[in-house]
């Protein structure tokens, strides 16, 4: 049960995560016009990893794409290919992870196959996080560098009284939901990693080993095997976890010479 | 078509107060940043003020900050120029301008004026 | 404050000759961020309100006639009158848009010759 739901909630917070992560990647306000200690101006600048945007003061907004590829920052490149990468990873760690459900019946699925599923997705998901929060990381990093050159010279002087007013810009709002979103993903992958460890079946299955008293048959199963009592031959016993997900009343096993002392 | 009409303008003595209204239609007045522009007589443009659509932000000339308040109510189609300790410097047509929209900020429609006359 | 310097102050120009009035602005008034100048052009006419000509420096507002034309980037600007008609004599203005308080220039009073 605990299994059951650490993987169902990795789950739901990576799904939110991946889903904050596409949302960051979209959005325009990755950086944003800083308006502390400056002139007041009349248009309010932003830009995302895809467009830089103005609205006026009237409320008007006109965004426009980076329609170049090679004119572009290697910085800016580098954060989207993070970003993509992190998308695309949670994408597929996302379709793994619901086939790995152990809440999900799909034909006659091992236990084990839904632990490597579990994983794999978990995997899936640490990386996919950390590719956002690292893409969102450079970005910021890029953006306090430029902020402290451009006010080491914000008014560059281009002559006599005449002045060009740098427009600095800041943290935007794409940045913590990225961070947040990252975050999330990477929980979400390491709860799946945990709950893997709970689907896993045991590595060493030993033959059960019955010890037969006088009145009445104690069965002792070691790794992975519950004790129970009862009389006779009738006597069934369940193992905890099995990478079938079969139970002895499922499969006789039948006494061989070893299975009495 | 769209229609500024300004009102409140008049006589008044220096210290006095003046409420200046310009009544708007022709367009969703609520959609609009408004302006009021002034011009003393036989002198050049002045702009005094700016509203959002929404009432916040607000701007001013720094002359004029503490003195004069822009306000507006969307419901009456509205905008008003509250004036407070008029000097004689005031004197001029004062302008209600609409902030235009995919006109660079630009005040595309302006009203025909009414005259604010400060003098003992 | 930006300060904005028209000039001339007046100007007499013959009708059908091309009239010109430059404005200059004590910043930029280009927006790095979509490469736009945010500079406004205005005519007013004795007894009226100004009426906007141009918008963005080049931008002619609807109406207005493909004899007027603005120019100009950064700090440097200038409206056009190609062919003078008699309806065209005024006083233009200047604007500074892109930072508050929005300024205007002293204006330039255009006559016929």
């Known amino acids: 049960m605990a299994v059951t739901a650490c993987q169902g909630l990795g789950f739901v917070v990576s799904l939110i995560g991946i889903a904050g992560i596409i949302a960051a990647t979209c959005m325009d306000q990755w950086s944003t016009q800083d308006l502390y200690n400056n002139p007041v101006t009349a248009v309010f600048n932003y830009q995302g990893l895809w467009r830089s945007c103005v609205r006026e003061s009237s409320g008007f907004t006109e965004c426009r794409g980076y329609f170049t590829l090679l004119g572009l920052p290697a910085m800016l490149q580098a954060v989207r290919a993070l970003m993509i990468v992190g998308i695309v990873l949670g994408a597929i760690g996302l379709l793994v992870s619901i086939f790995a459900l152990k809440c999900i019946r799909i034909g006659s699925m091992e236990d084990s196959a839904k632990a490597n599923m579990t994983l794999t997705s978990g995997i899936m998901f640490i990386v996919s996080g950390l590719c956002a929060i690292a893409g969102v990381s450079v970005f910021a990093n890029m953006l306090v560098t430029n902020f402290w050159m451009s006010t080491a010279n914000m008014y560059t002087g281009m002559g006599g009284m005449v002045q060009t007013v740098q427009t600095r810009y800041t943290f935007g709002a794409a940045l913590f939901v990225g961070w947040v979103a990252g975050g999330l993903t990477l929980i979400g992958g390491v709860m799946m990693c945990i709950a893997c460890r709970g689907l896993a079946p045991e590595e060493t299955n030993y033959k059960a080993v019955s010890y037969h008293a006088s009145g009445h048959s104690v069965a002792y199963k070691p790794g992975g095997f519950k004790a129970s009592t009862g009389f006779g031959s009738n006597t069934k016993n369940k193992k905890i976890y099995d990478g079938g997900a079969r139970t002895e009343d499922e499969v006789q096993s039948y006494p061989s010479k070893h299975d009495y002392v | 078509e769209v229609q500024l009409v300004e009102s409140g303008g008049g006589l008044v003595q220096p210290g006095g107060s003046l409420r200046l209204s310009c009544a708007a239609s022709g367009f969703t007045f609520s959609s609009f940043g408004m302006h009021w522009v002034r011009q003393a007589p036989g002198k050049g443009l002045e702009w005094v003020s700016y509203i959002s659509s929404g009432s916040s932000p607000i701007y001013y000339v720094d002359k004029l900050k503490g003195r004069f308040t822009i306000s507006r109510d969307n419901a009456k189609n509205s905008l008003y120029l509250q004036m407070n300790s008029l000097r004689a410097e005031d004197t001029a047509v004062y302008y209600c301008?609409?902030?235009?929209?995919?006109?660079?900020?630009?005040?595309?429609?302006w009203g025909q004026g009414t005259l604010v006359t400060v003098s003992s | 404050d930006i300060v904005m310097t028209q000039s001339p102050d007046s100007l007499a120009v013959s009708l059908g000759e091309r009239a010109t009035i430059n404005c200059k602005s004590s910043?930029?008034?280009?927006?790095?961020?979509?490469?736009?100048?945010?500079l406004a052009w205005y005519q007013q006419k004795p007894g009226q309100p100004p009426k906007l000509l141009i918008y963005?420096?080049?931008t002619r507002e609807s109406g207005v006639p493909d004899r007027f034309s603005g120019s100009g980037s950064g700090t440097d600007f200038t409206l056009t009158i190609s062919s003078l008609q008699a309806e065209d004599v005024a006083v233009y203005f200047c604007q500074n848009d892109l930072f508050y308080p929005l300024t205007f220039g002293g204006g330039t009073k255009v006559e016929i010759k």
């Open positions: 963005g420096a080049s």
């Open positions: 910043q930029s008034l280009l927006n790095v961020g979509n490469q736009k100048n945010y």
């Open positions: 301008a609409r902030a235009g929209y995919a006109v660079r900020n630009a005040l595309d429609y």
